[in-house]
Each structure stands twice: as C-alpha cells, then as structure tokens.
C-alpha cells in the first residue's frame, strides 16, 4: 500500500460498497501522486478503533461516545477532522446538551431530586447519558442497576425505550415507554412536549430543540436553561449554560504516526469534488443504500481539528466527566458540600518545589501538578487534571477563550481593604539603558529585544500590539535583529539571545534564565537593547534588592523608559511614560471549581500571605526571591473580583480588543484549539 493511502474502515456491507465507490471516484479526480483511499471492512466500530490502533486501518468516523472509547488506552486515537452542519459561513460542529425548564418553576440543577424528568430516550446522549452521567454521584445508592437509581432519584419520568415492567417509574409520564415516534414523548421534540404539556418539570434535550419546536420568541421566553453552576439562563444563552458541548461526528486517527495531514488532504479534496451539491455521480454525504454511511447524510462538509486538540479537550470536561461516571461508576467518598484539595498547576521544577512546600504547609488542602508551559497548565485545568493557577492577563485571555474563569486577582499595592478592592492594573513599560541615549520608541527596528514570554501582557501583547499597528505584519522576528521571547519557535531570531541550555533554550518557564519579568530585565542588562516588562521590575531588581550576582550591583538610575511620543523618562515616571495599563495577574479555574478555589485560596492567604513577616523561617505564598514562582513576588493579597468574574469583564474591553487584533499573529496552538470549540 503506497504511503499516501488512507485506509478507511467500514462497518457494514453497505459502508464497504460506498467506500469502494469513494475510492474509485477519488482516483478519477486526484492526480496519481495525491492521496488515495483503500477500504478495510470490520464488524463493528470498536473493531475499527482497534484496527486503527494496530495500524491495520487509518480512519473512521465516530459519534462522540465512540470518540471517547477511541481515546482510551490502549487505543489512544485522536480527533483529526470534524463534520460540520449548517452553512459554510456558520459551520456547526458541536451541539449542546441542555436541561430545559419552565420559567416559573424556581428550582436549580442541584435541586432536581424529586422532580419529574423528560428524556429523549434511554441510552441517548443529550437525553440520558449526559444528564444522568453528570448527576451520577447524586443518585441514591446502590447506583446499579442505573435505571433503578434514576427512578428513585426523580419522582417520575418518561424515558422512552426503558423497561416499563422492571422500572415503571421511568414510564410514569409516558405509559409504555414506547421506543418510536408512536410515543408522543419520544425523541427531542417528544421530550420537550413532555415538559410543555406539564407532564415533566425538566426536559433533557439539544440546544436547538426549543427553537425547532417554538418559532415564536415570546413562547420561548416561557422557558429557561438550568446551568451547572446552579443558576438559570435564557434559552438562547445555551453556549454559556449547558450540560455538555458534544461533537456531532468526527474522524479519528492514531495519535502518533496517524497520517492526520494526509487524511485532511484527502477529505478536503473529497469535499471539493463530491461534497454538498458538487457531483451527481457520487455524493460524499448521501447514502442511497442505507443511512449515514461513512459520514452523516446531514453533514455539509469537513473542518480540520486543530493539532493541539486531543480527545479530552475535543469532547470537553463535562462530557468526559459524564461518560466516565457512567462507565466507571466511581464517586468520591467525601460529602459533596466539602471542598476537595485544589490541584495547583506548577511550571517546571522551580515552581513545583515551591508548590510542594505549599502543599505540605497547607496540610493537603493544596496538591501540585506539573506542566512544562503555561498553555499545558491551562489544558490540564480544562480537562480536570489540575484546578487552578495564577496567570498573566495574556493567558487569562487564552484561558477565558478555553472556558476557564478568573476567580481572584493579585493586588500589588498595600491598602487597608486589599482583599475587597481589585486594582485597576499595572503599567507595561519599555526599558532601555541610559547609556543608549539615541534609542527611542520610534527607532527600535533592528535592535535587540527582551520579552517576558510570547503571549504575556507587558512582555508581548501590549508592545507587539502597538508595533503591529505600526508595521501591519506579524514578522516581529524580522523587525528586531534578535531577541529573547520565550515561547518563540526555536529557530526564530527571537530565541537567539536566550540563555537556557539545550532543550531549555527559549522555553516559556523558569528553566530559561531570561523568562519572566526578572529574566527579561536580565536579558537587557546582559545582552539586549530594550526590555518589555512591568513598571515595578527595575526597582525590584536594582539597589541590591535582588542578591543574584548579575543584579546585586545594578542602579535604577542607569535605566530609562521609552515613551510612546518618542521621548524618554526616568524609571520612576512610569505613570506618564508607559505603553499601556495591564490587567493584574489573576487566578483562573473551571466554573465548577470556582467556589472551592475561592474559599481555599482565601484561607491559604490568611495563613501564608503578606501577614507572615519572617519568610526565612516560615512559608510565604507570595515570595520567591524575585523569581515570581506561582504568584508575582510583589503580590500583597488576592482580591475578590466582585462582578468582574468573566475574562472579558476582568480584562476590560480595551485589552480584549487589543489581544483580539493580535490574534492574527498568534502562534498559540491552544487558542486555536479553543476557538475551534467556541469560535
């Protein structure tokens, strides 16, 4: 089999026939050096998954539940291409599983016990697996058989396809539990009708169900959605209030050596030639000899799944939690109203050591998880491997796009009411050596630059955003002659000045000596012409305040700031000479952990915060001798956000817009993956 062949896995005679037709028609339109199709027939989707894992086949299209199976060891498959529905301009690759209730019913998600429930059907995704999976640990024990536990949880249900003899309560609202449209409460529309008629209190359906059944907005306004954080939202806010976001139909491949680029090349060409309304003789999204053969008949095309996206990220935390609960049937022993330990994400070994020390001192209230980059940490928080970390504003933006929420803000100024008063922000500045007297904001081209890291606020987003507005392109590595911007591509000129050894060179963590505020300033001191840092960086590292050999003899007076009007000012005049105001660093977490992270961190800062005077003999949460480990070292306290509790509200319209403009220059694979899930 030539290397450019994609071995498609078919699960029935009809699929195999369509696959052969697909193969033959692709041959007729694609040059001989292009991708080709071969067909492999297996008895079931699980057999296909195993065949792909064993390198006997390359690709198959699966529903969400099977994508989960495909991801589990030892299969380790990943999503590579998604089918989309709707239009090319507004492609839908996901649907949302929602819980719909009547507006005046007055209960929340955590008060469903004893209510009457309407389901699309037993074992179906939005109508059963997701809601019951998420409610699993609230079900009365024993939880097996599941139907009995569900019957005892709700006071009555309609769950079409359930066994009405063994579990009559599941058929109480629809006698007989018929498994077809003969049952008026069967399927999406049926489950909604069950709620509408007043038979049930809650219907578990798809986000589109209510729109398909109620054309009139006034009618829709009589309903609300139950959110997982025990609030309610209008039915059109399903993107912010759902049980899970579920991919419709996805092509999977091996994680390693999986031919993902070849599969995309093949399917992209296939949709060009044989997609919707393209060809009479062969149609990719049509099944004359059956239904949904190889691909869904309702699909309109394909989209490439971003490479950073593994199955866990693609399926989403809520969906994975629901399915794992159903499959594994394990629940924590701790009472659910008690906070579990917060798993803090630490970057590389320096932060890990400080985190471990915190963990010991917290007596297990804090646990530690390691990752090599900030984006890896954000991904771990998304999928539940970690719970929280403190982030620079640029990463608060990425975390927000990935569905995380800010929960507390670092405050840097001493005040009587520190914890109740989140600050307006700090200043992003451009620092130069006083001796380089000809250097201004207007003649930085060809100079050597020092950045905290790619994607961070003061070190990248603000200066590069301003620069982009001037030069109108993203080739910052051509604008500066060389520099150190940790997180850049290793062969970029923006890694040339970095000092990390071997694989640590230019890494966006403390293994790279020029990483972060202190690192960028050190880069200026030792090699660079300009450093993009925060307004406190110079005073914090001069006048003997940083005992490290490179810093101990530095004098603040030897440095100046570049102002946007082309002038220069002394370092202490940052208020009148800065690039922009930057939002303070903030702690982020998943929505479901928000309350516990808030509670535990407030306890922790009372024990180990700025009130601790002797850090040589006691653990201090906000100290790490200028290394900014876990938190910035100048943090005075972690402050409540009040109503600034979304990333947009926290960062502010101006900053969100600035980072949004810079998105075209973004190299963030995580941001690409998260905007795929939520454009």
């Amino acid at each position: 089999v030539p290397d450019k062949t994609v071995r498609w896995c078919a699960v029935s005679e009809h699929e195999a026939t369509k696959c052969q037709s697909f193969r033959d028609h692709m041959k007729s339109v694609i040059p001989s050096d292009g991708p080709s199709v071969a067909c492999v027939k297996k008895a079931s989707y699980l057999d296909c998954i195993r065949a792909i894992a064993a390198n006997e086949a390359d690709a198959v299209t699966l529903d969400a539940g099977l994508v989960y199976d495909a991801y589990l060891a030892p299969n380790n498959l990943k999503p590579v291409v998604a089918e989309f529905y709707g239009s090319k301009e507004d492609p839908q690759t996901f649907y949302y599983a929602v819980a719909v209730v009547k507006k005046d019913s007055g209960f929340q998600m955590n008060q469903l016990r004893g209510k009457k429930s309407c389901h699309t059907g037993l074992g179906r995704s939005a109508g059963w697996n997701i809601p019951i999976g998420l409610l699993y640990c609230d079900l009365p024990e024993p939880r097996k058989p599941l139907e009995k536990a569900v019957a005892n949880f709700f006071s009555g249900s309609c769950a079409p396809c359930a066994d009405g003899t063994d579990f009559p309560q599941l058929c109480q609202l629809c006698p007989g539990c018929g498994c077809s449209t003969l049952n008026q409460y069967f399927g999406y529309s049926g489950a909604f009708k069950c709620l509408k008629d007043g038979a049930g209190d809650v219907a578990f359906v798809k986000h589109s169900t209510i729109f398909e059944n109620l054309a009139n907005k006034a009618d829709r306004d009589q309903y609300e959605l139950l959110c997982l954080d025990n609030t309610r939202k209008p039915v059109d806010e399903y993107k912010d209030c759902h049980l899970a976001q579920v991919p419709s139909h996805t092509v999977v491949a091996r994680s390693m050596g999986g031919k993902e680029d070849l599969i995309w090349e093949l399917l992209n060409q296939a949709q060009e030639h044989f997609g919707k309304d393209k060809s009479k003789e062969f149609q990719l999204f049509s099944s004359p000899h059956g239904k949904d053969l190889l691909f869904k008949d309702s699909a309109h095309g394909f989209l490439k799944v971003p490479p950073r996206m593994d199955a866990k990220m693609y399926l989403g935390y809520e969906y994975v939690t629901a399915i794992r609960n159903l499959r594994e049937g394990t629940c924590p022993e701790a009472p659910t109203d008690e906070c579990k330990p917060v798993k803090w994400c630490a970057l590389s070994h320096h932060e890990r050591l400080k985190c471990d020390e915190w963990s010991v001192n917290s007596v297990g209230k804090i646990e530690c998880v390691s990752a090599e980059t900030t984006e890896d940490c954000i991904a771990k928080i998304m999928n539940g491997e970690a719970d929280a970390m403190s982030l620079d504003g640029g990463f608060v933006y990425i975390a927000g796009k990935c569905g995380l929420v800010p929960v507390l803000a670092e405050n840097y100024n001493k005040s009587d009411n520190c914890e109740d008063t989140p600050e307006a922000g700090y200043f992003a500045i451009a620092v130069v050596k006083k001796s380089a007297s000809d250097l201004t904001w207007d003649n930085l081209k060809g100079k050597k630059s020092c950045h905290t890291a790619v994607g961070r606020t003061a070190g990248w987003n603000i200066p590069m955003g301003l620069l982009y507005n001037k030069i109108n392109h993203c080739r910052f590595d051509e604008f500066f002659s060389e520099g150190c911007a940790p997180g850049s591509k290793k062969d970029s000129s923006l890694c040339k000045l970095c000092m990390g050894s071997g694989l640590n060179l230019c890494e966006p963590n403390n293994k790279e000596g020029y990483y972060g505020y202190t690192g960028a300033f050190r880069c200026l001191v030792e090699k660079g012409d300009v450093a993009f840092v925060k307004h406190q960086t110079v005073p914090q590292n001069t006048g003997g305040k940083n005992p490290d050999p490179w810093a101990k003899n530095l004098n603040e007076k030897d440095y100046e700031l570049l102002c946007l009007d082309g002038t220069r000012k002394p370092v202490e005049e940052y208020a009148n000479c800065h690039l922009a105001r930057a939002p303070n660093h903030a702690v982020v977490t998943r929505k479901d952990k928000e309350a516990c992270v808030h509670k535990i961190l407030r306890q922790q800062q009372h024990l180990f915060g700025s009130n601790v005077t002797d850090c040589s003999g006691n653990f201090c949460l906000f100290r790490s001798e200028t290394k900014d480990l876990l938190f910035r070292d100048d943090t005075v306290c972690l402050a409540k956000l009040h109503d600034r509790n979304t990333y947009e509200k926290y960062l502010g319209e101006e900053y969100v817009k600035a980072v949004g403009n810079l998105r075209k220059c973004s190299t963030s694979s995580l941001l690409e993956a998260c905007t795929f899930r939520r454009p």
Epitope: L353, E357, V360, V363, G617, N618
Partner: nanobody, 117 residues
C-alpha cells in the same frame, strides 16, 4: 547553607520496613519545612512526605498510612519510617530543606531503597 546527608536505605522484601535518616550539618531548627522526595528510574522526582517546623505533616496519597515523617530538631535530623513497603516504593530517596528551592535543582546523593523478593 545547611548540608543534608541521607542514609538508611537498602534492600528489603515486600511488606518489610526501613527507617531513613537525613542529618543536617547546620541547625534545622530555624528551617520551616523539611521533606522527603523519591525518584524511580525514568520517572519524575515526587514528593513523598513533608513536615513543617511545628510538626504538621503531609503525605503523598500512595504512602499515606504506611510512611511516617518526623523531625528531631535537637539532633538536626529528619526521619522517614517506611512500613508495608511495596515494589513500587523502589527509588532513590532524597531529603530537602527547601532553602535552595528558588535557585537550582540542588540535591544530595540520596539513599537507594529497593523492595524486591
């Protein structure tokens, strides 16, 4: 800078016990947190147990109920009593005083613990 020397490792059968010691060349009294770490071949170094200056202890989930950390400030020594040892406890065990945490990975020689029948 306090110098730390680990000892007490050895070969032991599953279910057996060992007591590791970590002797400090300077006073550990003023040091807040002391901890034992371990590193198995091809794995990351991981925290096993820690003890604060006031004697508060914390353990990794995998050793809870089997290992006990203690400190004797007068003798400038930290101990790790390991009972019910399992083959997966095989590793080099290190102790740290966290005082060097912000500079580099600066560890002693460690002491090898091998659990095998």
């Amino acid at each position: 800078q306090v110098q730390l020397v680990e000892s007490g490792g050895g070969l032991v059968q599953p279910g057996g016990s060992l007591r590791l010691s970590c002797a400090a060349s300077g006073s550990i009294f003023s040091i807040n947190t002391m901890a034992w770490y371990r590193q198995a071949p091809g794995k990351q170094r991981e925290l096993v147990a820690g003890i604060t200056r006031s004697g508060t202890t914390n353990y990794a989930g995998s050793v809870k109920g089997r290992f006990t950390i203690s400190r004797d400030n007068a003798k400038n020594t930290v101990y790790l009593q390991m009972n019910g040892l399992k083959p997966e406890d095989t590793a080099v065990y290190y102790c740290t005083d966290y005082s060097r945490r912000y500079y580099q990975d600066d560890w002693g020689q460690g002491t090898q613990v091998t659990v095998s029948s």
